[in-house]
C-alpha cells in the first residue's frame, strides 16, 4: 500500500508568492511559493495518485504583515481552503497567547491540530478540551493512518503559551500514544511536529512505532540529487534513520517560507512496516501557476493589508536616526529603539531566579535602512517601519558563548570608517572600543546586564559563560562577515517578524523617545 | 463617499488606441483592487481586469492580454485602462468598478462610451 | 474559466408577484476557506452602471430592499424578488467572485407583465 506525504512547515504568513530568498515578491515571473501557487500542485497530485495526505508541521503563524492584521484568521481560512489533514503546534501558534489561538485557528480549523507533549491545566483544560488533540486517525483510501503531534518544549522560552499549558518532553509523552494507536489496530503511524530536526531524528530513533518523522522548527532543507534552488541540503530526503529496534524510519522536513511543497512516498507492507521511501521537495516556483480562484480569494484579502500599512502605530517625539552615518559609526537611537524592542518582546518570567531569560541585543547598523522623522506630527506607521527594515527578516533567539561574542564585537570594528554594515547596535550590552588599537584587538571592556538577578546590573562579559542573545536572522546565518556566530552558535531559535516587532512595541509604549545613552563609547 | 468619475466618450479609428481614466476620491485609492469592465452595446457585461494601485499589482483576462495596459497614478488617485489595436467590435462603455472586502464591483464609475469607427 | 449560464434569458412578472431568476455556474463557487459562496447578482438599469444587490449568494448589500433574496450553493443559485416593482424592471446579472477571470452571466431581462 502506498501513501503520498505532502508537508509544509515555517511557512511563516508567506501566504502571497514570495521572491526567492521568501521576502517580498517584487518581479512576479521570479517569485515562488504562495497558497495559491501550492493548491495547484496538491490538487495536481491529489489528482494523479489516490492515497494522499497534506500536513503541516507548524509555524503558520508570524512573519509578514498578513499574521499582524489577520491574527491567524488567514492562516484558518486558507489551509481550510487547501484541504489539509493535519497541523502539528508550532511555538509561534503561541505568539498572541492561548486565546489567540484558540479564536481564530483552532476553533475555526476543519482539519485535526496535534500536540501530544502540550498538556493544559486548570481553568484553561475544560476550554480547550478538544480543540487540539494528541493524534488523530486519519482514513486513507481503504486503510487508516494515524498522526501525532508534537511541539518545541522550549515554546514557554520562545512564544507565550501562559502559565496554564505544560511542555512534556517529547519521547516522553509520544510513546503512550503511539503505543494506544497500536491498541487500536493503527499500523501506520507518522508523527509530526515542531522541536527541530535533532529531535526529529531522536523520535524515529527512540519512539517505538513510529513510522515517519515530519517535522519542522529548524527550517531544515533535505534534498536528493542537485538542489533545484539556492538552499544547500542539510542531507538526503528522506533522511533515514536506524531505530533502537532496528527499523528504517524516514526523517523529512521541507525548508520553510512554503518556498517548496515536501513530497514522501512511502510503501507500507499489510503489516504497517515501511519497506521503501522516496521523494524530494518540490520547488513552488512560476512554472507552476497561481490557482485562480485563491488566487482571486488572497487578491480579495489582501486589500485590508495595506489599509493598516498607513495607520498609525504610536508617535516619536524625537528625531528616529537611522541615518547610515550615524548607525553605522556610532550608537544611533534607532538602534537603541529596535534593541530595546527585541529584548520587550522577548520578556518571558518562566523562573524566580531570573527577571528574564535574555538581556542583550546585538543588532547590524546595516540593517537599519531608514530614519523616521518626527516632524510629520510624530506619526510611526507599518508603512515607516518597512522602509527601516525592509528585508524580512526575522529577530531570533540564540545561545553563544561570551568568546563568541567578544570575536563579533571585534569584527564590528575591524575595518572601522568605511560606512560598512557590520558595525553593532546593542541592547543590555555597553561596549567600548579603542580604534588606536589594531583590528581584533579593539574592544577594551564589555559588559553584560545579567539576567540572573533581582536588580539588574552590567557585569564584564566572562568568556567561557553561556549567553542568551536577541539579534536578526541575517547575522545568526552569519551575515556581514560574522561568520563566528553561524559556526559557533550553541543553539538558534527563530523569532517574531522583524517589522513586527518593533511595531507592537511602538504601540504598547504609545509615545517614544529613544536617546543616545552610552551603550557604545570609544576611548 | 466613494466616487468614480470616468473620462469622455470617445470616438476611436480601427487599429488606433484609447486610454480611459477613472479619478477615484473618498477613500485610499491606493489600498483598494480597481477593475475595469466593458459592455457592448445591448450586450452583457465582460471583465478586462484590475489593478491594486498601493503596488501596482495587476490581473488581466486572457481575452485581453497583450492589447490592454492597465496603470494606476497614485499623486492624483487616477486609474487608466488603455486598449490598443482598436476594431469596431470593441465598441462599448467601459466602466472601472472599485473592490471590497466582500465583493469585487460594488462602487461603479458612470462608464465612458468608446466608439471605434471608420 | 468559469462559466456563468443565467435563465431565463428574459422574464416577465406582473406587479406584487415573485420573480425568480437562476444562475448555473460551470464549477462549484465555493469558498472552502469560509463555506461561503462567491455570487454576486447585480441589478442594471438602462443608461446606469449595474448596482450590487447581493453578494456571497445570500447577503444583500446595504440600502437594497428586504424583497430581494439571493439561495443556492455550489453550482446553482437563484435571485428571488418577493413582489415585484416597477422600479425592479432592469437586467440582472449574476457574477462569478470566486475565480480569475471574473465572469458575468448573460443577463436577464426583467420586464411587469
Known amino acids: 500500500w502506498e501513501l503520498t506525504i505532502l508537508h509544509t512547515n515555517d511557512v511563516h504568513s508567506r501566504l502571497e508568492q514570495t521572491s526567492e530568498d521568501s521576502s517580498k515578491c517584487v518581479n512576479a515571473s521570479r517569485c515562488m511559493g504562495g497558497v495559491a501557487r501550492l493548491f495547484t500542485k496538491v490538487q495536481q497530485i491529489r489528482r494523479a495518485e489516490p492515497n494522499v495526505l497534506l500536513l503541516d508541521a507548524g509555524d503558520q503563524y508570524q512573519g509578514t504583515i498578513w499574521f499582524t492584521v489577520y491574527k491567524g484568521a488567514e492562516v484558518a481560512h486558507f489551509m481550510n481552503a487547501l484541504r489539509y489533514d493535519a497541523m502539528a503546534l508550532g511555538n509561534h501558534e503561541f505568539d498572541n497567547g492561548v486565546e489567540g489561538l484558540i479564536e481564530p485557528l483552532l476553533k475555526e480549523a476543519k482539519f485535526p491540530i496535534l500536540s501530544a507533549n502540550i498538556k493544559a491545566k486548570g481553568p484553561l483544560a475544560s476550554q480547550i478540551s478538544g480543540l487540539y488533540l494528541p493524534y488523530k486517525v486519519l482514513p486513507v483510501g481503504d486503510e487508516v493512518v494515524g498522526i501525532v503531534g508534537y511541539t518545541s518544549k522550549e515554546t514557554p522560552f520562545l512564544s507565550n503559551p501562559g502559565t496554564n499549558l505544560v511542555f512534556e518532553d517529547e519521547i516522553t509523552a509520544l510513546q503512550p500514544e503511539v503505543d494506544k494507536l497500536k491498541t487500536l489496530n493503527v499500523n501506520k503511524i507518522i508523527a509530526l511536529g515542531h522541536s527541530g530536526f535533532e529531535m526529529d531524528k531522536l523520535i524515529a530513533q527512540k519512539v517505538r512505532g513510529v513510522d515517519v518523522v515530519v517535522g519542522g522548527h529548524s527550517n531544515t532543507f533535505l534534498y536528493t540529487g542537485n538542489p533545484p534552488s539556492k538552499e544547500v541540503p542539510a542531507g538526503k530526503y528522506p533522511f533515514i534513520v536506524t531505530s533502537d529496534d532496528g527499523r528504517k524510519v524516514p526523517v523529512v522536513q521541507a525548508y520553510a517560507f512554503g518556498k517548496y511543497l515536501g513530497y514522501l512516498k512511502i510503501e507500507f507492507d499489510e503489516r504497517g512496516n515501511v519497506i521503501s521511501s522516496h521523494g524530494n521537495p518540490i520547488l513552488l516556483n512560476s512554472s507552476i501557476p497561481e490557482d485562480p480562484s485563491i488566487k482571486a480569494d488572497i487578491n480579495k484579502w489582501r486589500i485590508k493589508l495595506d489599509n493598516y500599512s498607513t495607520q498609525e502605530l504610536g508617535k516619536t517625539i524625537v528625531y528616529l536616526d537611522g541615518s547610515s552615518q550615524s548607525c553605522r559609526f556610532r550608537e544611533c537611537n534607532m538602534g537603541n529603539l529596535i534593541c530595546d524592542a527585541m529584548i520587550n518582546n522577548n520578556l518571558r518570567h518562566t523562573d524566580e531566579m531570573f527577571w528574564n531569560h535574555v538581556s542583550m541585543c546585538i543588532l547590524n547598523g546595516g540593517g537599519i535602512r531608514s530614519p523616521i522623522d518626527e516632524r510629520n506630527n510624530g506619526t510611526i506607521t507599518w508603512e515607516n517601519l518597512a522602509a527601516v527594515l525592509p528585508f524580512g527578516g526575522t529577530f531570533d533567539l540564540v545561545q553563544l558563548k561570551g568568546s563568541t561574542l567578544k570575536k563579533a564585537f571585534e569584527h564590528s570594528v575591524h575595518r572601522y570608517g568605511q560606512s560598512t554594515g557590520e558595525f553593532l547596535q546593542v541592547g543590555g550590552i555597553h561596549v567600548v572600543y579603542d580604534l588606536s588599537r589594531k583590528p581584533g584587538d579593539r574592544v577594551v571592556k564589555l559588559d553584560v546586564l545579567c539576567t540572573k538577578c533581582r536588580v539588574p546590573s552590567y557585569d564584564p562579559l566572562k568568556m567561557d559563560e553561556v549567553y542568551k542573545v536577541i539579534l536578526p536572522n541575517f547575522l545568526a546565518n552569519g551575515g556581514d562577515g560574522f561568520q563566528m556566530i553561524k559556526d559557533e552558535l550553541l543553539r538558534h531559535d527563530s523569532g517574531d517578524q522583524d517589522i513586527n516587532v518593533v511595531s507592537t512595541y511602538i504601540s504598547k509604549m504609545k509615545v517614544i523617545y529613544p536617546a543616545v545613552e552610552g551603550r557604545i563609547k570609544f576611548s | 463617499q466613494v466616487q468614480l468619475v470616468q473620462s469622455g466618450a470617445e470616438v476611436k479609428k480601427p487599429g488606433s488606441s484609447v486610454k480611459v481614466s477613472c479619478k477615484a476620491s473618498g477613500y485610499a485609492f491606493r489600498s483598494y483592487w480597481i477593475s475595469w469592465v466593458r459592455q457592448a452595446p445591448g450586450q452583457g457585461l465582460e471583465w478586462m481586469g484590475q489593478i491594486f494601485p498601493g503596488d501596482g499589482d495587476i490581473n488581466y483576462a486572457q481575452k485581453f492580454q497583450g492589447r490592454v495596459t492597465i496603470t494606476a497614478d497614485k499623486s492624483t488617485s487616477t486609474a487608466y485602462m488603455e486598449l490598443s489595436s482598436l476594431r469596431s467590435e470593441d465598441t462599448a462603455v467601459y466602466y472601472c468598478?472599485?473592490?471590497?472586502?466582500?465583493?469585487?464591483?460594488?462602487?461603479w464609475g458612470q462608464g465612458t462610451l468608446v466608439t471605434v469607427s471608420s | 474559466d468559469i462559466v456563468m449560464t443565467q435563465s431565463p434569458d428574459s422574464l416577465a412578472v406582473s406587479l406584487g408577484e415573485r420573480a425568480t431568476i437562476n444562475c448555473k455556474s460551470s464549477?462549484?463557487?465555493?469558498?472552502?476557506?469560509?463555506?461561503?459562496?462567491?455570487l454576486a447578482w447585480f441589478q442594471q438599469k438602462p443608461g446606469q452602471p449595474p448596482k450590487l444587490l447581493i453578494y456571497g449568494a445570500s447577503t444583500r448589500e446595504s440600502g437594497v430592499p428586504d424583497r430581494f433574496s439571493g439561495s443556492g450553493s455550489g453550482t446553482d443559485f437563484t435571485l428571488t424578488i418577493s413582489s415585484l416593482q416597477a422600479e425592479d424592471v432592469a437586467v440582472y446579472y449574476c457574477q462569478n467572485d470566486h475565480s480569475y477571470p471574473l465572469t458575468f452571466g448573460q443577463g436577464t431581462k426583467l420586464e411587469i407583465k
Open positions: 464549477q462549484s463557487l465555493l469558498n472552502s476557506g469560509n463555506q461561503k459562496n462567491d
Open positions: 468598478a472599485r473592490m471590497d472586502f466582500y465583493s469585487w464591483f460594488p462602487y
